[in-house]
């Protein structure tokens, strides 16, 4: 999906009003020195591409983020503010339902959510180049 035509300000508002707080709740009890961000993004569409990938694509050691509250709210925001996004996700959602597993918060998941927080920070304040 190409995130170029999303309403970035509306997504930012959704993130700041609820998603950010859910991410903080998920990370509670984790030391702020624990994880170094290794995933970066250069502009808002790129940030959303990376955010979608980390939030919804299962990875080795962390298969369950898509069922977390922040993930559901992220999906809702993208569905509302990115034209045509929901349609592209129908097949992906059906596939996810088939492999649904028990929620487990692993260290790998915590690291992944730390990466997500960093990606959202760059989404909220895109490009260290002149805007």
């Amino acid at each position: 999906y190409d995130f170029t035509n999303c309403d970035f300000e509306k997504i930012k508002a959704a993130y700041l009003s609820t998603i950010s707080k859910d991410l903080i709740t998920y990370m509670s009890g984790t030391k702020s020195t624990e994880f170094n961000n290794t995933v970066s993004c250069s502009n808002r569409p790129h940030c959303l591409t990376e955010i979608q990938s980390l939030t919804f694509n299962p990875t080795a050691g962390c298969a369950s983020l898509a069922k977390e509250m922040f993930a559901m709210k992220t999906k809702a925001a993208l569905a509302i503010w990115c034209p045509g996004y929901s349609e592209t996700q129908i097949n992906a959602t059906q596939a996810m339902k088939k492999r649904r597993k028990r929620k487990v918060t692993t260290n790998k998941c915590l690291e992944q959510v730390s990466q997500l927080q960093g990606l959202w920070r760059r989404f909220n304040r895109p490009l260290l180049k002149q805007q």
Partner: antibody, heavy 119, light 107 residues
Framework: EVQLVQSGAEVKKPGSSVKVSCKAS????????IEWVRQAPGQGLEWIGV????????NYNENFKGRATLTADKSTSTAYMELSSLRSEDTAVYYC????????????WGQGTTVTVSS | DIVMTQSPDSLAVSLGERATINCKAS??????VTWYQQKPGQSPKLLIY???NHYTGVPDRFSGSGSGTDFTFTISSLQAEDVAVYYC?????????FGQGTKLEIK
Amino acid sequence: EVQLVQSGAEVKKPGSSVKVSCKASGYAFSNYLIEWVRQAPGQGLEWIGVIDPGNGDTNYNENFKGRATLTADKSTSTAYMELSSLRSEDTAVYYCAREDNTGTAFDYWGQGTTVTVSS
Amino acid sequence: DIVMTQSPDSLAVSLGERATINCKASQSVSSDVTWYQQKPGQSPKLLIYYVSNHYTGVPDRFSGSGSGTDFTFTISSLQAEDVAVYYCQQHHRFPLTFGQGTKLEIK
């Protein structure tokens, strides 16, 4: 506990340079932008620029372009602001600050470094 | 550059009364406005981000509102420890810019 500790006061001659350091602790240094802001005596706040310690990307206020240089050393979790061609109007308190967890504000500030430019 | 203009420059309010500071941007900054408090000899402190969100530990008597170009910062019931200079800042476009500050005193 997040802390930003800045280097001590400096007195400089016009035309010289100054390098202010900002040592971060209590968080993953490369994950958060470091901002630099200055405040002339009795005046308001002026943004100098920002650096991403993770990759070295910078953005400068045009008013300081060519005179200010922002760098970061990940091995010591220290950010630096160097200002060259100093003039008396550069006399100010210089602050480093960290972006907050959402990327929309500065949540932790250094104690400030007073730079006095005088002949 | 986006110019942030605060009004008034100084304000005297009685203890327990409401204090209101306005901040006007020279062009739309969406909701990307932050408010800081600075006491004499201290570094600025973050109070409100993204117009109306309280930073951790900031008392409820502080609040912010507005969007676009017009923003308001309010202290609902002034306490002695609120005497300070207050700054608005826009985070919408580089270079980031601050208002000139509003000095709040007790009447």
